[in-house]
Each structure stands twice: as structure tokens, then as C-alpha cells.
Interface confidence: low
């Protein structure tokens, strides 16, 4: 049988009673000789093909219990006719056997007289008939075939005889094995009950583990249910808090960069003005009026308009307002608020543990009391009483069997000796026939006359006639033995062995009021004095065969209902009522008004409305109107084209100044522009869809807040119920298992069914009836064939 299933008990949490090992095999293997037994069964089926006569047997048994039987009653006559009809095959065989018994001695006697008067064969002919040799051959072959058939029959007899001896010897061991199994049943049962009780502690430990770790089991369950709706929102807010910090950093960087740029640009502008002034002053040199220097000077004068700083760098709007806004936003510690949110979630298991200390203690008290209740119930089980009574019966039966086994073995020796004599006698007859045939064939001389034939040939004839004589003397005695064993063996096989195997015999015994006219069901009347309770031999035998427990097999629930006494519902109800007082209050903090305002302020801080393109446009432009290095080199080249003197030197000095301006002014501006670009990009990324993001986060926040407001209590209730179901599940499962084990597994009555099988199926049918039937089948066949043998021998 399987385990009782409990929906809430963990699947892996299965109990198993330790297996009880029994010694006795519950089926008997005949071995190769089984083929011979099957042959007899086939013969019996031919002789007796009708189904087991349940009704006839019932009526017969009812008549047998009557004190005085009226044979003239029609129903008695009909019953008699039914018995005759069923036994027709056997009766017919008996009639033929009786004819054989009566006729064989008479025929033998007359044949002997006839032979003595030289009338019945044995006369000597001078000349052979034409068909004489052919007839002789036919007779010899026929006799040989018949002798072989007789020999097979004798072989069957020997085998059967040997089987009886060896099998009866095995009976003692078989009986001991059965009694050992019955003792095992008696001894194991208290151990099984102890084991069942011990499993309560295992169950209780499992529940205690869950109770002790209520923080992770219940708290964790609640947390797992809430997490998916809250953590994503907190994560989003956390990422927004990071974004605010990054924005502040970017704005600060941008601000300082812009300030640097303004200063650097002004300085560049100032420097370029100075150098332009210097160049203009240089170009006032009189040399510039003289050709070809005048062209160079004009070229330089024209190029001066290029020496301008990019004025737009100084016009880039500030980000003070945005930075102020972000700084205001950062006054609220959004990170801290988010952390509070996470913390309030992570605190759930501990809060659950703190709030359930009393309830857990209460449940533990209930669980401890259930243990003692179960102990009381198992103490009162009637299994022990039945087993005690059964123990007495087992002891009596064992001593009875041990007392009578020597007698059985003694009778078996007589049977074996008788069988040996019978088989030996038949063997002697068939040996004479074989010798007669052998001598006849070996000593035959077709030219010799009857008076001059050889000694061997003559001896052959003598052997044949001795065989015939012995056949006439003993075959009728053998047939008596065959008929008697046949009637007994065939009826036992047909009326006990076969219906026992098919359980039809149990159905007869289960007939209401049959074995006791006061009891509807014999077994329940005998065991419990409650004959109305349906307890049948067939059901008890089948249940025991299936290894079912005594409690379930004998329907002990009628005298002690374990379900009522265990009262699963009452126990689980006690746990449930304790669990009902399990109340958990959670305070989950999400963000609060300050946090919400913080997000809204950040959304309104203006970084999404900044004109990033104007900043980015400037980062791509040159700080000066021209590449100052190129301008300086060009100026140097032009200066070099002038004749040596003040003009040339001052121009070269100015070129050098421009290079310095590039180095000291332009390069730092380019560096600042690169920094500005990075800051703008960060801000652009953060500002992109900021309002939508914050709106979405606030919507998620509202959803999460609604979820907490509307669902937290139902989540707690559901998880608490689930937790309760798990705890209760352990005990429901355990109590169902107890019920199942006591009903189906404890004190398995299989040894009883095995003992019955041993007594009927093995001992009676396999050890006695099968060899007995093979014996009469073999000897009967040999005896029957003695008749044609003696005819052909004569």
C-alpha cells in the first residue's frame, strides 16, 4: 500500500514502517516433477471436467450437520443425484476398476484350468501356419510397447513414492519456518507500534524547526510576496537618488567650467586685444609705407580682424539656478529614505518573529500534548489482545504438530514401504515379460520343431508364462489399491486443493449460518461474538495474503475505531486555533511626502529644459576666431620677408606672443570645453525624459503604496494560513499515516495466510495429494496395461 497523501505535507516527508522479513516462501515450486503432476491434473480434468459444486457442497454440509437425515426427502434425493452427477467420472472409473478387480481373478482361474487341460494354447505344432512368424512378430512388438507403457507407469509410481518420503521429511522444517514467522509477527508488532510513536518526535521536530524559524518561513513568505511590488519602485527611486547626485556633480563641474571659461575667454580677449594693439603700433612703422614692405604690412593689417576670441563663450548662460534647485533637492536625504524603505522590508522576518513569540510557544505546548494523546491511543489498541490470544493458539498448535510429526513420519515409512512393494511387484512382472521377449527373440530357430527347440527359447516361454501368472495373481489386488487411492486423491484434489487455490472453498465456508446455524458470519462470531459483522474467510485470507495489517483485515475499527480515538480534526483544530491568534502587524515605509516632494522638485529643477545644444555648439567651436598657431607662423613668415630692423623684430615678438597666448590661453579653454562637453552630456542623459521618468516612478510609488495599503493584510493572512497549513500538514500527514499504518501495516497477518497455504496448499496438496495422485495414476496405468500384456504374452 502507498502512503496517505496530505496536500500540505511536504512531498519528501514520507514515513515508512521498517520492513518485516519472513522466512517462509508464500508459494511452493514443484520443480521438474511438476510436469508429471500436471499430467495427472489433466487426466483428472478429463475424468471430472465439471466446475466446483459450491451449492451442492453447501447443501451437503448443511445435511451433514443435521442430527438425523431423512433419505426419502425429495431434496435429499436431489442432493444425492447432484453428487452422483458431479462424481460421475470418478464413479465410472471406480466401476471399471471394480470390474477389473472381480473379473481378473475369475479369468485367471479359468485360464489356469483351461491351460492345465491343454485347451488354452501351449500345444506343439509340427508345421507352422503360413502367418505364424508374422503373428509372432506382431505379438512380440505389441508386448514390448505395452511393457514400455507399464514401465512408464511403474516409473511414475517410484517417483511418487520417493516424493512422499522426501517431502514429508521437509514438513518439520516447513512447520518450524511457519512458526518462526508467526513468532516474528507477534514480536514485531510492539516494535512497530513503538516505531510509529517515535515518528511523532520526528514530525514534531520538523514542526518545531518551522516554528523556530518562523522569521524565515512565514516572514520570508510575506517578504517574497511583497518584494516584487515594492523592490522595483525602491530600486527606481534609488537610481533616481544616484541620478540627482550625478546631476549635482555634473552641474557643479559645468558651473566651475563655465566660470573658468568666462575668465579664460575674457583673458584671451584681453590678451588678443593687447597683441592687436602691439601689432597696430608696429604697423605704424615708416617701413610699412615703402614698397614692397607696404604689401606685407597691409596683409598683416587685414588679418588683424581675425584675432578675436569667441564672444559666445562668455555668453553661455549660467546653471546656478539649476544647481541651487538640485542642492535644495539634496537637502532631503532621498538615499536615506530609500534605505529606510529597504530596511522596513528586510525587517519583516524579525518583526514576524518578535510578534509571534507567544503564539509559537502555545503551538509547541499543543504539539507536546498531542504526543501523549497518541501514546494513550496506541496503548489501547485491541491488536495486542488479539495477538496475545493468537500467541496461545500458536503455541498449542506448535506443540501439537511437534508431538504428532513423528507419528506422521512413521506412517509415511509404511506408505513408502507399501509403495515400494507394489512398484517392485509390477517391476518383477514386467521384467519377466522383458526376459521372455529377450530369450524368445535370442533363442528362436525357425527350423527347430517344438520338441527340439533350444533351452533359451524354451526359457523365454517360461518367463512369459510366469509374468502372466503373476499378473493374474496380483493385478486385482493392485487395482483395489489404485481405486481406493484414486477415489481419495481425486476428490481431495477436486474438492479441496483446486477450490482452495481459486478461493471457491472460502466462498463455501463463508456461507451465512453454514458452520454455525446461529452465526451469519462464522469468523466474526468466533472472534468478536458479533456474527452480523461481515468478516469472511475469503476477505481475511486475501487481505493477509496482501500483507495487510491485522487491524484492517479483521475490521477491528468496529470494536476500537482508531480514527475516532486519534481524532485528527480535534488535534489539527487545536493547532489551528492557536494559529488563529497569530497576528502580524507590519509597518512598511515607502517614501513619504518628503521623498515624493523631493522627486517632484528634481523633476522641476530645470535640467530637462536647459538649452544643451547651445552649450554643445560652443564646445565644437574654436576659442579664437582663427588658429593662433597658424596665425603666428604666418606672421613669422611675413616678418621674415621684411628687411631686418625694428618692424621685423617687433612682428616676430608679437608672433611669439601669439604662440604664448595659444599655449597659455587657448589650450586651457579647449580643455575646459572638453570638460563642459562631458558634463553637458551627463546632464542631457539625466534630463532626457526626466519628468516622464519621475511621473512613472510616482505612479509606481502610488501603485506600490496602494498595494501595501490594500493587500498587505491579505498577504499576511494568506501567508499565515499557508504557514499554518504547513504546520498542520505535518501532523495531518503523520496522523493519517498512523491510521493507515495501524490499519494496513502493523501486525501484518501474512504469516497466518502463509501458514494456511503451508497446511493446505503445500503440505496436504503438494506433499501428499500430488504424489498420491501420481502414484495411483502410474500404478493404475501399469495395472490396466497388464491385461493386454498377458494376452499378448500368452
Amino acid at each position: 500500500g502507498g502512503q496517505p497523501s496530505s496536500t500540505d505535507a511536504p512531498k519528501a516527508w514520507n514515513y515508512e514502517l521498517p520492513a518485516t522479513n519472513y522466512e517462509t516462501q508464500d508459494s511452493h515450486k514443484a520443480g521438474p516433477i511438476g510436469i508429471l503432476f500436471e499430467l495427472v491434473h489433466i487426466f483428472l480434468y478429463v475424468v471430472q471436467p465439471r466446475d466446483f459444486p459450491e451449492d451442492t457442497l453447501r447443501k451437503f454440509l448443511q445435511k451433514a450437520y443435521e442430527s438425523k437425515i431423512d433419505y426419502d426427502k425429495p431434496e435429499t434425493v436431489i442432493l444425492g443425484l447432484k453428487i452422483v452427477y458431479y462424481e460421475a467420472g470418478i464413479i465410472l472409473c471406480c466401476v471399471l476398476g471394480l470390474l477389473f478387480i472381480i473379473l481378473m481373478p475369475l479369468v485367471g482361474y479359468f485360464f489356469c484350468m483351461c491351460r492345465c487341460c491343454n485347451k488354452c494354447g501351449g500345444e506343439m505344432h509340427q508345421r507352422q501356419k503360413e502367418n505364424g512368424p508374422f503373428l509372432r512378430k506382431c505379438f512380440a512388438i505389441s508386448l514390448l510397447v505395452i511393457c514400455i507403457i507399464i514401465s512408464i507407469g511403474i516409473f511414475y509410481g517410484f517417483v511418487a513414492n520417493h516424493q512422499v518420503r522426501t517431502r514429508i521429511k521437509r514438513s518439520r522444517k516447513l512447520a518450524d519456518s511457519n512458526f518462526k514467522d508467526l513468532r516474528t509477527l507477534l514480536n514485531e508488532t510492539p516494535e512497530q507500534i513503538k516505531y510509529i510513536l517515535a515518528q511523532y518526535n520526528t514530525t514534531k521536530d520538523k514542526a518545531f524547526t518551522d516554528l523556530n524559524s518562523i522569521n524565515s518561513v512565514l516572514g520570508g513568505g510575506i517578504l517574497d510576496r511583497l518584494r516584487p511590488n515594492i523592490i522595483p519602485v525602491l530600486d527606481e527611486i534609488k537610481s533616481m537618488a544616484t541620478a540627482i547626485k550625478e546631476t549635482k556633480e555634473a552641474l557643479e563641474n559645468m558651473n566651475s567650467t563655465l566660470k573658468s571659461l568666462h575668465q579664460q575667454s575674457t583673458q584671451l580677449s584681453s590678451s588678443l586685444t593687447s597683441v592687436k594693439t602691439s601689432l597696430r603700433s608696429s604697423l605704424n612703422d615708416p617701413l610699412c609705407l615703402v614698397h614692397p614692405s607696404s604689401e606685407t604690412c597691409n596683409s598683416i593689417r587685414l588679418s588683424l580682424s581675425q584675432l578675436n576670441s569667441n564672444p559666445e563663450l562668455r555668453q553661455l548662460p549660467p546653471v546656478d539656478a539649476e544647481l541651487d534647485n538640485v542642492n535644495n533637492v539634496l537637502r532631503t536625504d532621498l538615499d536615506g529614505l530609500v534605505q529606510q524603505g529597504y530596511q522596513s522590508l528586510n525587517d519583516i522576518p524579525d518583526r514576524v518573529q518578535r510578534q509571534t513569540t507567544t503564539v509559537v510557544a502555545g503551538i509547541k505546548r499543543v504539539l507536546n500534548s498531542i504526543g501523549s494523546d497518541i501514546d494513550n491511543v496506541t496503548q489501547r489498541l485491541p491488536i495486542q489482545d488479539i495477538l496475545s490470544a493468537f500467541s496461545v493458539y500458536v503455541n498449542n498448535t506448535e506443540s501439537y504438530i511437534h508431538r504428532n510429526l513423528p507419528t506422521l513420519e512413521e506412517y509415511d515409512s509404511y506408505w513408502w514401504l507399501g509403495g515400494l512393494v507394489i512398484c517392485s511387484l509390477l517391476t518383477l512382472i514386467v521384467i519377466f515379460y522383458y526376459l521372455g521377449l529377450l530369450c524368445g527373440v535370442c533363442g528362436y530357430d525357425r527350423h527347430a520343431t517344438p520338441t527340439t527347440r533350444g533351452c533359451v527359447s524354451n526359457t523365454g516361454g517360461v518367463f512369459l508364462m510366469v509374468g502372466v501368472g503373476l499378473s493374474f495373481l496380483f493385478c486385482w489386488i493392485l487395482m483395489i489399491i489404485v481405486v481406493l487411492t484414486f477415489v481419495f486423491g481425486a476428490n481431495v484434489e477436486k474438492l479441496i486443493c483446486e477450490p482452495y487455490t481459486s478461493k471457491e472453498l472460502f466462498r463455501v465456508l463463508d456461507t451465512p449460518y453454514l458452520l454455525n446455524e446461529d452465526w451469519e458470519y462464522y469468523l466474526s462470531g468466533k472472534l468478536f461474538n458479533k456474527s452480523k459483522m461481515k468478516l469472511t474467510f475469503e476477505q481475511v485470507y486475501s487481505d493477509c495474503k496482501k500483507n495487510r495489517g491485522t487491524y484492517g483485515t479483521l475490521h477491528l475499527q468496529n470494536s476500537f475505531n482508531i480514527s475516532e480515538h486519534l481524532n485528527i480534526n480535534e488535534h489539527t483544530g487545536s493547532i489551528s486555533s492557536e494559529l488563529e491568534s497569530l497576528k502580524v502587524n507590519l509597518n512598511i515605509f515607502l517614501l513619504g511626502a518628503a521623498g515624493r516632494k523631493n522627486l517632484q522638485d528634481f523633476a522641476a529643477c530645470g535640467i530637462d529644459r536647459m538649452n544643451y545644444d547651445s552649450y554643445l555648439a560652443q564646445t565644437g567651436k574654436s576659442p579664437a576666431g582663427v588658429n593662433l598657431l597658424s596665425f603666428a607662423y604666418d606672421l613669422e613668415a611675413k616678418a621674415n620677408s621684411l628687411p631686418p630692423g625694428n618692424l621685423r623684430n617687433s612682428l616676430k615678438r608679437d608672433a611669439q606672443t601669439i604662440k604664448t597666448i595659444h599655449q597659455q590661453r587657448v589650450l586651457p579653454i579647449e580643455q575646459s570645453l572638453s570638460t563642459l562637453y562631458q558634463s553637458v552630456k551627463i546632464l542631457q542623459r539625466t534630463g532626457n525624459g526626466l519628468l516622464e521618468r519621475v511621473t512613472r516612478i510616482l505612479a509606481s510609488l502610488d501603485f506600490a503604496q496602494n498595494f501595501i495599503t490594500n493587500n498587505t493584510s491579505s498577504v499576511i493572512i494568506e501567508e499565515t494560513k499557508k504557514y499554518g497549513r504547513t504546520i498542520i500538514g505535518y501532523f495531518e500527514h503523520y496522523l493519517q499515516w498512523i491510521e493507515f499504518s495501524i490499519s494496513e501495516k502493523v501486525a501484518s497477518c501474512k504469516p497466518v495466510a502463509t501458514a494456511l497455504d503451508t497446511a493446505v496448499d503445500v503440505f496436504l496438496c503438494s506433499y501428499i495429494i500430488d504424489p498420491l495422485n501420481l502414484f495411483w495414476f502410474g500404478i493404475g496405468k501399469a495395472t490396466v496395461f497388464l491385461l493386454p500384456a498377458l494376452i499378448f504374452a500368452v
Epitope: K259, H262, Q263, T266, Q267, P311, Q315, P318
Partner: antibody
Framework: EVKLVESGPELKKPGETVKLSCKAS????????MHWVNQAPGKGLKWMGW????????SYADDFKGRFAFSLETSASTAYLQINNLKNEDTATYFC??????????WGQGTTLTVSS | DIVLTQSPAIMSASPGEKVTISCSAS?????MYWYQQKPGQPPRLLIY???NLESGVPARFSGSGSGTDFTLNIHPVEEEDAATYYC?????????FGAGTKLEIK
Amino acid sequence: EVKLVESGPELKKPGETVKLSCKASGYTFTDYSMHWVNQAPGKGLKWMGWINTETGEPSYADDFKGRFAFSLETSASTAYLQINNLKNEDTATYFCATDYGDYFDYWGQGTTLTVSS
Amino acid sequence: DIVLTQSPAIMSASPGEKVTISCSASSSVSYMYWYQQKPGQPPRLLIYLVSNLESGVPARFSGSGSGTDFTLNIHPVEEEDAATYYCQQYHSYPPTFGAGTKLEIK
């Protein structure tokens, strides 16, 4: 709140030297350039020049090169304007102003300098 | 240096009227700034980058223009608006101010 507080009115004789101060508060001093603007009585505003508060490097308008000097005391968040060899035409109100690029967003209350023999 | 010419130099207006002050640059500039100065006080920034209103400045002030011609409008003018108004550029070094327009309220 950003504040620029200038030193009190000054009365000087020609040829003397004066040092006007401008104390900044409410922001990081080195973040903004400091400019000086002059306003002669009944006249318009005239830009004198500026000082890079990060590097301390001054830059002067053409009309104010020579006798005028800008300096800093960064630790005290203070900028100074020193005028040497004062002349009667130096009589004016002197403003310090921080710039945010192309314009002057915060101004000191102004220091009145009177040069008279 | 870029020269800024403001017109008119002096003007008067009654409360509720619309006042327009012009500023003309000697060469093209990208941006223009406007300041208000009351007697005994430092200048106060009104408009930056041609048309942007500085925080705290009433909405009746507005700026417009491009290239060399820029305008400051006050509508409706109020008594407290009596002051001298300056335009300023920093497009080209050095920064320069206009000579100022004095607004009187009748």
C-alpha cells in the same frame, strides 16, 4: 545669498594712494571673476577691468592702465582696487561686480572716492 | 571698442504708458544686457541675453532686438520704474556700457 560689501567712502588729496576693498560672501570666491566699474558723478558706467580670482591675473581697460592696480586676498574672499597718485578726475563711485560671462549679476553697494585739494 | 548709443538720453512717461528705450551698437553684437540704476544704488540686472528676464524682475519689462539695434520696453510703466537704464555688451573685448537713458515719471 551672494553679497559684495565694499569699504566706506574715502576723501583723499591729489597725489595720495587709496586702496578700496570688496568682500564677497555667499559663494565660492574663486568661482567668479571680479570686475571694477567706475561712475563719475552724474555720468554713465565705465568698465575699468577685471581680475581672475583663480589665478590672480589682472586685466585693465586702456583708460585705466598705469595708476590702477587690482589685487586679491583669496583667504578673506576680498578683492582690492588700489589707485596711486590720485587726481581730481578720479573722483567717482567705484563698484565691484561679479560676472557670469557677459554681464554683471551681483554688484557691491559702491565706494565714493572724493579727491580734492 | 564697440560703442553703444542709447536714445533718448532723458525721457518722461506717465504711469501705465508704454516706454521704449533704444540701444544702437557700432558693430554687430550677439547679445545685449540691460541694467536699471536708481540714485545712490548700484546697477541692477534686468534683461540678459537680449530678452531673458532676470529672476525677481517684474514681467512688464521686456527686451528685444538683434545685430546692432536693441530695445527695452516697459509696459505699463509704474512710478517705481523712475531710474537710469543702461545697455551693455561684452560681445567684443572690452565690455562697454551705453551712456544711459534717464526715465522720469510724471
